[in-house]
Interface confidence: low
């Protein structure tokens, strides 16, 4: 099984002291969940805990909740248990272990399975700017925006066996919105996104995921056709439906990636036999034209868009009568306003995919930790109930981001000016699918 | 769109109950706040409430205890006010975080 | 609880002329500032959110500014049909989510 959302929300918060069984000898069992680990409010989730042929019960602890927090026999062959939640609430979420036990003892307990529900805030608005509509090498920021202040958010993209980034500011300081500049794009950046909103005294519970955007890439010089983007639905669908892939073949993106090298290749070639013809035309009819004048025909491919201007360009005047200065004139416009209130302004939609707002944080690099990444857990983290515990909030939060098997593959960006910004690069080919024996690596930004 | 109703004339020292009703969108997703308006006064925020699982919510100091948000369904939140004075007259917005506002309802306390 | 204080109450600025209005957090709000307009009998229009982003729709004229406890909303090329009420709002809350969302007193802009 491969590591869906491993680690999103891994938080590091070192738990108290628990009473543990006595741990034997024995193999560590595989906690999962079905559908996954990611569950909207009142939706049925099974929880599978996988030991072996030998185990004569199965335990599942949940943190912070009196142990064992469920038994179970094994079912047949005796490997596996089953254990039920029939309506996801947020009693449910947070962290699981479980143990078997054999004639010889009890086992390990399992790696954690963070169980998450989604719903438990209002949603957060996804955008992108300039435009969702990217030329390949250029830059775009998506902007996940909250109404509410939250001090988390997160981006997703279907069918990406990790995360993209988990950005969570400091207590006293919950903002309304988190920036993920991606620079430079590349066709893999292309894709539907997602991104939920949290808070910091309850990370096992996230917002309802924001409607999706989809990102295209367009072509550029290095790759004139026009790249299109993974074939996946705009449509907002159900909320329930999978955020994370549940059976990825591992090494398909790695394919993906030689493939379009491949093609890259192949394109190269034929625009280079392309001017060697061109240029052998040139010198057989004596044409005046110079070879630079020939070349510059071809530095910007068909359908390679200009960069929109930050801003939009340049903003014109509603009015030109507006440039007439005098009193009169104003007072007459004033006296136009209808009085009664009763107009509504519906110049947004009721998704307002409209940037509106800016994270701000000061952020300091710290060293990339390393983690074990425990393939069935989609979040890692310490959650708590929805409860304001005021303890909880006062304890040191840290920024993460969830990043490849490889360091090099994703760079973090010195935060300018107070404004919360996490440089994605172009995720690396292993992001589609991964091995559960691999760790993970995380860069924890620190927040203070 | 967003529009409140439930707003009239009381006299001091009784309740009402204001509804902000939602055409088009579900409340479940959003984040609904209540402000005021006193006549050729200025925006006083009373309370919003995180209209998701959580239903967490947050009141101006000078209206705990005395006004209450919730939410009544997947379209509707509400505003309980009691113990009203002349002081509370004014034009009740209720806005969402898809910046959405209504029109107002006006509540008029006099004896 | 928090205040916040706009300064001018009023202001009066001819066409194609600036104007700029302050308000100042009675605590550190960092950057949870939003700024709306509203004309008599309308509900307020949304401008700007955390301080310096601009809602869709909203002209490159109006910039926003500041962060902690001081803020600017500058208006610049001055229209007849930005003649309004301009309120600041505090758009963050602590760890006791104590500050809220309270408004500022509000500018009057007038337009001659």
């Known amino acids: 099984m491969i590591p869906t959302f491993t680690a999103l929300l891994c938080l590091g918060l070192s738990l108290g002291p628990r009473t543990h069984m006595q741990a034997g000898p024995l193999p560590k069992p595989t906690l999962w969940a079905e559908p996954g680990s990611v569950i909207s409010w009142g939706n049925s989730v099974t929880i599978w805990c996988q030991g072996t042929l030998e185990a004569r019960e199965y335990r599942l602890d949940k943190e912070e909740s009196p142990a064992p927090w469920d038994r179970q026999n094994p079912l047949e062959p005796k490997n596996k248990a089953r254990f039920s939640i029939p309506s996801m609430t947020e009693d449910y979420a947070g962290r699981y272990r479980c143990y078997y036990r054999s004639p010889v003892g009890w086992s390990q307990p399992s790696d954690p399975l963070e169980l998450v529900m989604t719903g438990a805030y209002s949603k957060p608005t996804l955008s992108a700017l300039p435009s969702p509509l990217v030329t390949s090498g250029k830059s775009v920021t998506l902007l996940c925006q909250s109404r509410s202040p939250m001090d988390t958010f997160l981006l997703i993209k279907e069918r990406a066996a990790h995360p993209l980034l988990h950005l969570r500011s400091e207590h006293g300081a919950q903002q309304h919105q988190a920036e993920f500049p991606m620079s430079p794009v590349t066709s893999v950046h292309g894709g539907t996104y997602r991104c939920f909103s949290s808070h910091g005294f309850s990370h096992y519970l996230l917002s309802h995921p924001s409607d999706p955007l989809e990102l295209i890439v367009s072509g550029s010089l290095e790759d004139p056709r026009p790249s299109p983007t993974r074939s996946v639905s705009t449509a907002a669908g159900p909320e329930d439906q999978p955020l994370m892939p549940t059976g990825s073949v591992p090494h398909s993106g790695l394919r993906r990636h030689w493939e379009v090298l491949i093609g890259v290749l192949v394109v190269s070639i034929l625009l280079l036999s392309l001017l060697l013809f061109l240029l052998l035309q040139h010198w057989r009819q004596g044409k005046h034209r110079t070879l630079a004048q020939r070349q510059a025909d071809f530095q910007r491919p068909p359908g390679a868009a200009e960069p929109e201007p930050k801003d939009g360009g340049l903003q014109r005047r509603s009015s030109p009568a507006a440039d007439v200065q005098g009193e009169n004139f104003c007072a007459a416009v004033k006296n136009t306003q209808p009085e009664d209130g009763v107009e509504m302004d519906t110049r947004q939609s009721p998704h307002d995919e409209d940037p509106q707002a800016v994270t701000y944080a000061k952020v300091k690099h710290s060293r990339p930790r390393r983690e074990m990444a425990s393939p069935p857990s989609p979040l890692s983290g310490e959650f708590l109930d929805t409860k304001d515990r005021q303890a909880e909030e006062d304890r040191q939060m840290d920024t993460e981001a969830a990043a490849s098997e490889a360091p090099q593959d994703v760079t973090y960006a010195q935060l300018h000016s107070f404004t919360l910004r996490q440089k994605a690069t172009e995720p690396p080919p292993s992001q589609e699918g991964a091995s559960p024996a691999e760790p993970s690596v995380y860069a924890t930004l620190a927040i203070h | 769109s967003v529009k409140e109703s439930g707003g009239g004339l009381v006299t001091p020292g009784e309740s009402l109950k204001l509804t902000c009703k939602a055409s088009?969108?579900?409340?479940?997703?959003?984040?609904i706040c209540w402000v005021r308006q006193a006549p050729g006064k200025g925006l006083e925020w009373i309370a919003c409430?995180?209209?998701?699982?959580?239903?967490?919510t947050v009141y101006a100091k000078w209206a705990k205890g005395r006004f209450t948000i919730s939410k009544t369904s997947s379209t509707t939140v509400t505003l309980q006010m009691t113990t009203l004075t002349a002081a509370d007259t004014a034009t009740y917005f209720c806005?969402?975080?898809?910046?959405?506002w209504g029109p107002g309802t006006l509540v008029t306390i006099s004896s | 609880e928090l205040d916040l204080t706009q300064t001018p109450a009023s202001v009066e600025a001819a066409v194609g002329g600036t104007v700029t209005i302050k308000c100042q957090a009675s605590?550190?709000?960092?950057?949870?500032l939003a700024w709306y307009k509203q004309k008599p009998g309308q509900p307020p229009k949304f401008l700007i959110l955390?301080?310096?982003t601009q809602a869709s729709g909203v002209p490159s004229r109006f910039k926003g500014s500041g962060s902690g406890t001081e803020f600017t909303l500058t208006i610049s090329d001055l229209e007849c049909a930005d003649a309004a009420t301009y309120y600041c709002?505090?758009?963050?809350?602590?760890?006791?989510?104590?500050?809220?969302?309270?408004f500022g007193g509000g500018t009057e802009v007038e337009i001659k």
């Open positions: 806005e969402t975080s898809v910046d959405l």
């Open positions: 709002q505090s758009r963050h809350y602590g760890s006791s989510r104590s500050y809220g969302f309270a």
């Open positions: 955390s301080a310096s």
């Open positions: 605590e550190s709000i960092y950057s949870g």
């Open positions: 409430i995180d209209t998701g699982r959580s239903a967490i």
């Open positions: 088009g969108m579900d409340f479940s997703k959003y984040w």
